[in-house]
Amino acid sequence: MRTEAQVPALQPPEPGLEGAMGHRTLVLPWVLLTLCVTAGTPEVWVQVRMEATELSSFTIRCGFLGSGSISLVTVSWGGPNGAGGTTLAVLHPERGIRQWAPARQARWETQSSISLILEGSGASSPCANTTFCCKFASFPEGSWEACGSLPPSSDPGLSAPPTPAPILRADLAGILGVSGVLLFGCVYLLHLLRRHKHRPAPRLQPSRTSPQAPRARAWAPSQASQAALHVPYATINTSCRPATLDTAHPHGGPSWWASLPTHAAHRPQGPAAWASTPIPARGSFVSVENGLYAQAGERPPHTGPGLTLFPDPRGPRAMEGPLGVR
């Protein structure tokens, strides 16, 4: 368990001495403070590469840049897991790996990164505009998901570098650069706060947040009693949209498929919303959301151009798979 400080909504200063200049000097410290508070936020990176040798064979690499212990990794395609995506593989750090066609080989590359090779033949083969998502369930950070796809015009084998090193280098460079700025910013912030210490500042409200934060659940026991836990394979149609998982069991999905997040606004996007989401024309991109932030009603820490956010406040129960069938 850990306590995270949540940055309160900025309240406009009372009218008076400061005027327009005061507005600027007060907004800056809070922007810097926000950056300081969210500086240690973990991220997930995703790299998708088409093999030059087999045109319809893909390699997906994902990694988690955070300090928590990874409980589980789920790789899906066609959208975020639990929001229309179809599970390709589930990896547990000690208990092993489950994978479903067209996944050919899923494996751990390091303690915090995985790779997945997709078979490239027949109706189940992926195509260039397919989106692949990786979800890392980590404690105490929560669930973090990132998605990536090949740009439409990419040449086979050249869509992304053969290793995730450039991505990691970019991240490290970013981390180092941002760290410098943040260090300077935090020092400057302390300086400003010291100068304005006579003025009462809004307090930070600490709140206990962890993957065990309460969740609203809509149970459906009658369905669950017959639901299949494991789906040995998934039939994927050629249009590259995620296919329905066929389990040959008459009673719909399991109880947790119906599980709902606390706030409707935080529900993961459905397939329709997903289909209309523009994908940046890059072979790899980072996109993160922590269920903990969504739960607390706080804005996700990393947003900006090229970042698509998929809130999932439900933790690993939302992971589709053996029981996660519709």
Partner: antibody, heavy 122, light 107 residues
Framework: QVQLVQSGAEVKKPGASVKVSCKAS????????ISWVRQAPGQGLEWVGW????????KYSQELQGRVTMTTDTSTSTAYMELRSLRSEDTAVYYC???????????????WGQGTLVTVSS | EIVLTQSPATLSLSPGERATLSCRAS??????LAWYQQKPGQAPRLLIY???NRATGIPARFSGSGSGTDFTLTISSLEPEDFAVYYC?????????FGGGTKVEIK
């Protein structure tokens, strides 16, 4: 090494409640779940329910749904199982066992606690 | 719920003999089946998971096979410490269920 240590034997009257604890050590508690299994004297094994140590989601057997509550305390790596409105047929050895952080995958039980005998008698 | 039927209920064999235990599911559980061994006064111990994978520290004389509805646990050559009760468990459907057990006793 990986170990689950359970609380001691309990004797309860019908209608009372019992809370059994299971302290885990030797592994990352939040990377797994805990399942509870009971065994009546001379009988086979009966699955009671499961809790994820990662996000505290639970799954209970239909027979005990409404009477059983499972919780975890990640700060002490301890799982708890509370059974209410006890009946004589609840007399059994209750085992905790390490399972998976999600119910759907990897949910075999290894290792097991030593067991806690709960006797319900008037 | 899935019903697991174990047979025979009791198996009387001598040390060194081969033991074959059967577990049949009322409907397909794919390969998601585990086997446990339990000795009197002890907690069960995992032997096999996912039908055929030996758990850590389990001797090679224990092997599992099968998929769908029919599963087998084989002990190639019984050792004195192998005389115990063996349970199968399906991990494929909710609720998770156990078989009634097979007791392997000394002949």
């Amino acid at each position: 090494q990986v170990q689950l240590v359970q609380s001691g034997a309990e004797v309860k009257k019908p209608g009372a409640s019992v809370k059994v604890s299971c302290k885990a050590s030797g592994y990352t508690f939040t990377s797994y779940g805990i399942s509870w299994v009971r065994q009546a004297p001379g009988q086979g094994l009966e699955w009671v329910g499961w809790i994820s140590s990662y996000d505290a989601s639970t799954k209970y057997s239909q027979e005990l749904q409404g009477r059983v509550t499972m919780t975890t305390d990640t700060s002490t790596s301890t799982a708890y199982m509370e059974l209410r409105s006890l009946r004589s047929e609840d007399t059994a050895v209750y085992y905790c066992a390490r399972g998976s952080p999600i119910y759907e995958h990897f949910n075999w039980f290894d290792p097991w606690g030593q067991g806690t005998l709960v006797t319900v008698s008037s | 719920e899935i019903v697991l039927t174990q047979s025979p209920a009791t198996l009387s064999l001598s040390p060194g003999e081969r033991a074959t235990l059967s577990c049949r599911a009322s409907q397909s559980v794919s390969s998601y089946l585990a086997w446990y061994q339990q000795k009197p006064g002890q907690a069960p111990r995992l032997l096999i998971y996912d039908s055929s994978n030996r758990a850590t520290g389990i001797p090679a004389r224990f092997s599992g096979s099968g998929s769908g509805t029919d599963f087998t646990l084989t002990i190639s050559s019984l050792e004195p410490e192998d005389f115990a009760v063996y349970y199968c468990q399906q991990l494929s459907h909710h609720p998770l269920t156990f078989g009634g057990g097979t007791k392997v006793e000394i002949k």
